[in-house]
């Protein structure tokens, strides 16, 4: 039931996970672990936040987004084939059995030896690894795959060009989003 994300050896992998804090700065503890989410915890923890800050991390694992706004997406730097597998994002919402847990599958492919293609106007060609599975699986919201060769400006431009399409909606709404409060 997990959503699959892809990256190539040597690239940075991106595993999305989001929630909406009840109020600015009113953060929820989050943990990321290697392995599927166990019943209470996060598996082999690689990064953890508390109500204020990132309080534990290991090398190559970091939060690139603004976690104070609920973007707790994990970036894994310079991936190798050994980074393949299931990762757990657990949003530890206070209260009785309120935790939200997401299992994300990371597939690492060998690095391509051909030069990276230039950005094309054909959306499918430009996004060969994009997953458009929102709403089609057991997770409440499924998300887009890693797009390591394309920057955010290019994504925004393409989204504008295709704002009326289903793909653009998926792109805009991507992320496992939890609303708190």
């Amino acid at each position: 039931s997990e959503v699959e994300y892809r990256a190539e050896v040597g690239q940075n992998a991106y595993l999305p996970c989001f929630y909406t804090p009840a109020a600015p700065g009113n953060l929820v503890p989050v943990c990321w672990g290697k392995g599927a989410c166990p019943v209470f915890e996060c598996g082999n923890v690689v990064l953890r936040t508390d109500e204020r800050d990132v309080n534990y991390w290991t090398s190559r694992y970091w939060l690139n987004g603004d976690f104070r706004k609920g973007d707790v997406s994990l970036t894994i730097e310079n991936v190798t084939l050994a980074d393949s597998g299931i990762y757990c994002c657990r949003i530890q919402i206070p209260g009785i059995m309120n935790d939200e847990k997401f299992n994300l599958k990371l597939v690492i492919k060998p690095a391509k030896v051909t030069p990276a293609p230039t950005l094309q106007r054909d959306f499918t060609a430009a996004f060969p690894r994009m997953l458009t599975t929102r709403g089609h699986g057991p997770a409440e919201t499924q998300t887009l795959g890693s797009l390591p060769d394309i920057n955010l400006t290019q994504i925004s431009t393409l989204a504008n060009e295709l704002r009326d399409s289903r793909l653009a909606n998926d792109l805009r709404d991507s992320g496992a989003t939890i609303r708190i409060g």
Epitope: A36, P38, V39, E41, C42, G43, V45, Q92, M97
Partner: antibody, heavy 119, light 111 residues
Framework: EVQLVESGGGLVQPGGSLRLSCAAS????????MSWVRQAPGKGLEWVAA???????YFPDSVKGRFTISRDNAKNSLYLQMNSLRAEDTAVYYC?????????????WGQGTLVTVSS | DIVLTQSPATLSVSPGERATLSCRAS??????????MQWYQQKPGQAPRLLIY???NVESGVPARFSGSGSGTDFTLTISSLQSEDFAVYYC?????????FGGGTKVEIK
């Protein structure tokens, strides 16, 4: 050395309340899920509450709404507040540490404290 | 809830003999290739002690005569050659779902 020491047990009347404590030492308490497990006299084991490292709470239906679990990481302490106690809550209550990274099974246990609910 | 049924309720074994204890779950406890089943030993007046986790992993400090096996819904704890200190009650426990549940126990007694 990991140690878990329960206290607060005793005799209480039906409908009454009791608060159990568990003092933890020998490990980084804040990183672990913790649970309470009970054992009625001559009976088997029953899990009654858990709290994750992040503070999320878990209960079986048998105690939901009557029991609450809490932790004080600064004091390395775990608590079980038991309200509206019934005769069937009579048991030895164990504090148990969930295995790191999982929490769903227990690698260290306290010696237990006896709670007797009787009029 | 996942119901765990242990059998037999009582097992009479002579020291040095092999003991085989069974635990059956009302639904699968497989999760991403791992069987989320544990075994504990409890002696009178003592707290339980973790023996086996994830169906077949022997906890540190537990003698090698203890082993676990099984997957899905059927699990087995085997004590290859019973020692006097092994006479106790054994419980299985699942960590697949809340509520966490234990089996009713198997008492291993001296024959």
């Amino acid at each position: 050395e990991v140690q878990l020491v329960e206290s607060g047990g005793g005799l209480v009347q039906p409908g009454g309340s009791l608060r159990l404590s568990c003092a933890a030492s020998g490990f980084t308490f804040s990183r672990y899920a913790m649970s309470w497990v009970r054992q009625a006299p001559g009976k088997g084991l029953e899990w009654v509450a858990a709290i994750s490292s992040g503070g999320s709470l878990y209960f079986p239906d048998s105690v939901k709404g009557r029991f609450t679990i809490s932790r004080d990481n600064a004091k390395n302490s775990l608590y079980l507040q038991m309200n509206s106690l019934r005769a069937e809550d009579t048991a030895v209550y164990y504090c148990a540490r969930g295995r790191e990274a999982d929490g769903g099974y227990f690698d260290y246990w306290g010696q237990g404290t006896l709670v007797t609910v009787s009029s | 809830d996942i119901v765990l049924t242990q059998s037999p309720a009582t097992l009479s074994v002579s020291p040095g003999e092999r003991a085989t204890l069974s635990c059956r779950a009302s639904e699968s406890v497989e999760y991403y290739g791992t069987s989320l089943m544990q075994w504990y030993q409890q002696k009178p007046g003592q707290a339980p002690r973790l023996l086996i986790y994830a169906a077949s992993n022997v906890e540190s400090g537990v003698p090698a005569r203890f082993s676990g096996s099984g997957s899905g819904t059927d699990f087995t704890l085997t004590i290859s050659s019973l020692q006097s200190e092994d006479f106790a009650v054994y419980y299985c426990q699942q960590s697949m779902k809340v509520p966490l549940t234990f089996g009713g126990g198997t008492k291993v007694e001296i024959k």
